[in-house]
């Protein structure tokens, strides 16, 4: 046993923080109770409401390069959200991971994965409003459904990546009062004769390239494509921001005001190894930076709601769809639906930005309904005049 | 109250072993960290390594890898020190001390053993 | 390994004195230093931790404080039982290391 845990070195932060005690203090447990009781919440909000978006998104709305960009946010989310009851266990139980080793570093790989692909995916979005508004015919013939879903790959397979490093270096750690901590362990692999420089090496380039990646370089081209659509459309007179720039908006204020607090807190840690002073400020409010950066997935639906009324619009009609299927008679269904049911081309053009908020036509008749539903998602509902009539250049 | 009780003195030969035990009480044994320091007149205190008997997790200073191996026994709240290959360098009075944390920070040796005094004699 | 330079090595001193002890660390160790008295019968007590500290049954004569890299025990008034040798200890990192100590004696 012991000989065993010589083999499996830990850094000093590390070693310290398995030290902590749980808490005695009755206030402090009220707290606990809130915790597990707001993430308990938190975890159910955000399956339902990102399950309901992707539902809404890829099944009620004409597939466009806009709500591609929404469907994959919101599969993030939903990937982020699917792990947080487990996250509320391990609050459940004292603050102890009983899940075991595996469990912890695919729970953890889940959390930096949508930490990831939430900043690529953003920064392509931005991205994509420039194109159009700065190279509009560039993006009336290249911008298609198929190309985003391409782009939107990459950028899953580039996190993934990007996750790689967090999943091999998760580690399950027991703590002097018997609880376990599933925590970063950066000497499980090759720790090297100066275990003490690796600890710093390690934990410091794990925060910069996190905080560079997933956090400064989305939020820099965010901003320089802001700058860019901003500028080009000042000149052409254009005042007031469209509303997927609101939507846009308020997932990039929400994207930074949640993973910011927890990167501030994460570079601390790094930096934690060389000025052990700021280990117990660190290990305080980490636990409150790492759940604000969780709810970030429970945020983006509401964001896409509230900044977008067609959506809403959308969820009320839908949320009926699926109560008339319930209620309607075997005699109803028929083919009609399926008959009149049109597919979207995988290269269909987007006709706008707009898309995601726009109000096209919807089917008439439960008939018509029960069909499209039936026939999953692939049906698509007629083409509004509305976005039939806008610009591949609105902003 | 707290109290870490050592063994007693012993004499040994050189090449030989000698294996030191720490008795803890008044505390619960597995919520905190054993720590062993090695006294030499006129050199100072030299801290060897410490114990988490909870899970067996040992952390050494590299000057004493190979020379010390600390094991711990939960039944008998009883930590222990071996030290092997003995030589005159190993002469000195060894300690034991608890070490352990709060909510939200961790702090070392508050309480000590009253020492082991070993010497190494042929 | 971090070292821990203390100073003076020996101090004489009477009773009622003021007396201050210096540790220096070698690198940063935020505050994560300990005090320990061992007396002449080589029993060691904590007195002070987190480098200012009072540790619980300990008199208020002693105090403990930091000024950079440098840390300071403070006796404001010696008593006879305070006669003792002195040591600081880092615990920022392993592996802990101790201050060469401070032999306090009667004047």
């Known amino acids: 046993m012991s000989a065993n845990a010589t083999l499996k070195p830990l850094c000093p932060i590390l070693e310290q923080m398995s030290r902590l005690q749980s808490h005695s203090n009755t206030s402090i447990r009220y707290i606990d109770h809130a915790a597990v009781l707001l993430h308990g919440l938190a975890s159910l909000l955000g399956l339902v409401e990102n399950g309901v978006i992707l539902f809404v998104v890829g099944c009620r709305m004409r597939q466009t390069v806009v709500t591609t960009w929404v469907l994959h946010l919101a599969l993030s989310d939903l990937l982020a959200s699917a792990s947080l009851p487990f996250f509320t266990y391990f609050l459940a139980v004292g603050h102890s991971w009983e899940l075991g080793t595996t469990f912890c570093k695919l729970h953890s790989s889940i959390f930096f994965l949508n930490m990831f692909a939430s900043g690529f995916l953003l920064s392509a979005i931005s991205l994509d409003r420039c194109l159009q508004v700065v190279r509009p015919v560039w993006a009336q013939n290249h911008r298609t459904v198929a190309a985003a879903h391409k782009v939107c790959l990459v950028l899953w397979a580039l996190a993934v990546l990007n996750t790689v490093p967090y999943f091999v270096f998760r580690d399950t750690i027991s703590r002097l009062d018997g609880r376990i901590m599933c925590y970063y362990n950066v000497l499980l692999l090759n720790p090297g004769p100066d275990r003490d420089a690796t600890c710093n090496s390690r934990q410091v380039a794990l925060a910069v390239s996190k905080f560079l990646l997933a956090f400064l370089v989305p939020l820099a081209i965010i901003a320089s494509s802001h700058a860019a659509v901003s500028l080009r459309l000042q000149h052409r007179g254009r005042r007031r921001p469209g509303r997927f720039v609101r939507l846009v908006a308020a997932v990039v204020a929400a994207f930074a005001l949640c993973w910011g607090p927890y990167h501030v807190f994460s570079l601390l840690e790094a930096r934690a190894h060389a000025n052990p002073g700021l280990r117990p400020l660190v290990w305080r409010g980490l636990p409150f930076v790492t759940s604000l950066a969780f709810f970030n997935s429970v945020a983006n639906p509401v964001l896409y709601v509230l900044t977008c009324p067609d959506m809403l619009r959308k969820l009320r009609r839908s949320l009926r769809t699926v109560l008339e299927s319930v209620l309607v008679d075997d005699s109803e269904l028929g083919g009609a639906g399926s008959s009149r049911r049109r597919r979207t081309s995988s290269t269909a053009r987007s006709a706008s930005p707009l898309a995601l908020c726009s109000r096209p036509e919807e089917p008439r008749g439960p008939a018509r309904l029960l069909g499209w539903l039936l026939g999953s998602c692939a049906a698509s509902p007629q083409t509004g005049p509305l976005n039939r009539a806008l610009s591949s250049t609105s902003s | 109250q707290v109290q870490l009780q050592q063994s007693g003195a012993d004499l040994v030969r050189p090449g030989t072993s000698v294996k030191v035990s720490c008795k803890a009480s008044g505390y619960a044994f597995t919520n905190y960290l054993i720590d062993w320091v090695k006294q030499r007149p006129g050199q100072g205190l030299e801290w060897i390594g410490a114990i988490h008997p909870g899970s067996g997790r040992t952390h050494y200073n590299e000057k004493f890898k190979g020379k010390a191996t600390l094991t711990a026994d939960k039944s008998s709240s009883a930590a222990y020190m071996q030290i092997s290959s003995l030589t005159s360098d190993d002469s000195a009075v060894f300690f034991c001390?608890?070490?352990?944390?709060?909510?939200?920070?961790?702090?070392?040796?508050?309480?000590w053993g009253q020492g082991t005094s070993v010497t190494v004699s042929s | 390994d971090i070292q821990m330079t203390q100073s003076p090595s020996s101090l004489s001193a009477s009773l009622g004195e003021r007396v201050s002890l210096t540790c220096r660390a070698s690198?940063?160790?935020?505050?994560?230093l300990s005090w320990l008295q061992q007396k002449p019968d080589g029993t060691f007590k904590r007195l002070i931790y987190?480098?200012?500290t009072l540790d619980s049954g300990v008199p208020k004569r002693f105090s403990g404080s930091r000024s950079g890299s440098d840390y300071s025990l403070t006796i404001s008034s010696l008593e006879s039982e305070d006669f003792a040798d002195y040591y600081c200890?880092?615990?920022?990192?392993?592996?802990?290391?101790f201050g060469g100590g401070t032999k306090l004696e009667i004047k």
């Open positions: 200890l880092q615990y920022a990192n392993y592996p802990y290391t």
């Open positions: 001390a608890r070490s352990g944390g709060s909510s939200f920070d961790y702090y070392a040796m508050d309480y």
């Open positions: 690198q940063e160790i935020g505050g994560y």
């Open positions: 987190a480098a200012s």
